[in-house]
């Protein structure tokens, strides 16, 4: 059985489209599942993973590697 | 089980500015978008735009470009639409909603604020 | 950006009919369509999703299809809840459109 464009698995129900954009950052693996590209984190591979040491409380990131301090916060990693 | 609550409904003038809030619940916030869909009274369907809470980043329908702000509280679990320089075409039911898991589109919905906008 | 044209723009039918709502895109969505049904005074609620998955706990009366440019949601046997207002969406890439609506009533 061959599955249509996107669809995966037994029975093609399973729906993967790899995306490289603001809703997502993911390749499809052979059964149809999201793999996150590098620097990219959660189920649909959209929050970026900051600066290692970068507070989680006070700090926050776009793009990943990045370490965006809230106001009254700063440094390297803002703490 | 998710949950989408948002504020009350808004009387508002022209020119000026409102803010509605979306309180989620029964997910991690910040691994999903918050996208904003308004209904202007007996008319279709509008996305006007995302924020992903995580970061902040938002993306944004060009008719709204520079007239809305979206926001987001991690610390509360909160998004935020703000429109501002309301004109009466603004008057509608806007909606906060949430996609679902498997990469479909907006299974979770708020229960809608209405906004006036009359002098 | 994608237009998501929709038709027909309303529809009278009776309980037990079959009735099929169309939606065009003005270019490839490769399946990243979705249907909701809207009631008066309601949010809508997601109904199929990837042109032709069922949402959770929707009768299964309800079916999509389609491919490319050209998708359709078809219900096979018209229950009284089903009279509503119906809406396709593109999710290709942003913004994410929506059709202009169906409304279906009772005839």
């Known amino acids: 059985v061959t599955c249509d464009d996107y669809y995966y698995g037994f029975g093609c129900n399973k729906f993967c489209r790899p995306r490289d954009d603001f809703f997502g950052h993911y390749a499809c693996d052979q059964n149809g599942n999201k793999t996150c590209m590098e620097g990219w984190m959660g189920p649909e591979c959209n929050r970026a993973i900051c600066r290692q040491g970068c507070s989680p409380k006070h700090g926050s990131c776009k793009l990943p590697g990045d370490c965006r301090c809230q106001y009254g916060w700063q440094g390297l990693y803002c703490d | 089980q998710v949950q989408l609550v948002q504020s009350g409904a808004e009387l508002k003038k022209p020119g000026s500015s409102v803010k509605v809030s979306c309180k989620a619940s029964?997910?991690?916030?910040?691994?999903?978008?918050m996208h904003w869909v308004r209904q202007a009274p007996g008319q279709g369907l509008e996305w006007m735009g995302a924020i992903q809470p995580g970061g902040g980043g938002t993306a944004y329908a060009q008719k709204f470009k520079g007239r809305v702000t979206l926001t987001a509280d991690k610390s509360t679990s909160t998004a935020y639409m703000e429109l501002s320089s309301l004109r009466s075409e603004d008057t509608a039911v806007y909606y906060c909603t949430r996609r679902g898991y498997d990469d479909y589109p907006f299974a979770y919905w708020g229960q809608g604020t209405l906004v006036t906008v009359s002098s | 950006d994608i237009q998501m044209t929709q038709s027909p723009s309303s529809l009278s039918a009776s309980v037990g009919d079959r009735v099929t709502i169309t939606c065009r895109a003005s270019?490839?969505?490769?399946?990243?369509l979705a249907w909701y049904q809207q009631k008066p005074g309601k949010a809508p609620k997601l109904l199929i999703y990837?042109?032709?998955t069922l949402a959770d706990a929707v009768p299964s009366r309800f079916s999509g299809s389609g491919s490319g440019t050209d998708y359709t949601l078809t219900i096979s046997s018209l229950q009284p809840e089903d009279f509503a207002t119906y809406y396709c969406q593109h999710f290709w890439s942003a913004p994410w459109t929506f059709g202009g609506g169906t409304k279906l009533e009772i005839k």
């Open positions: 029964g997910y991690t916030f910040t691994d999903y978008e």
């Open positions: 990837n042109a032709k």
């Open positions: 270019g490839n969505i490769h399946n990243y």
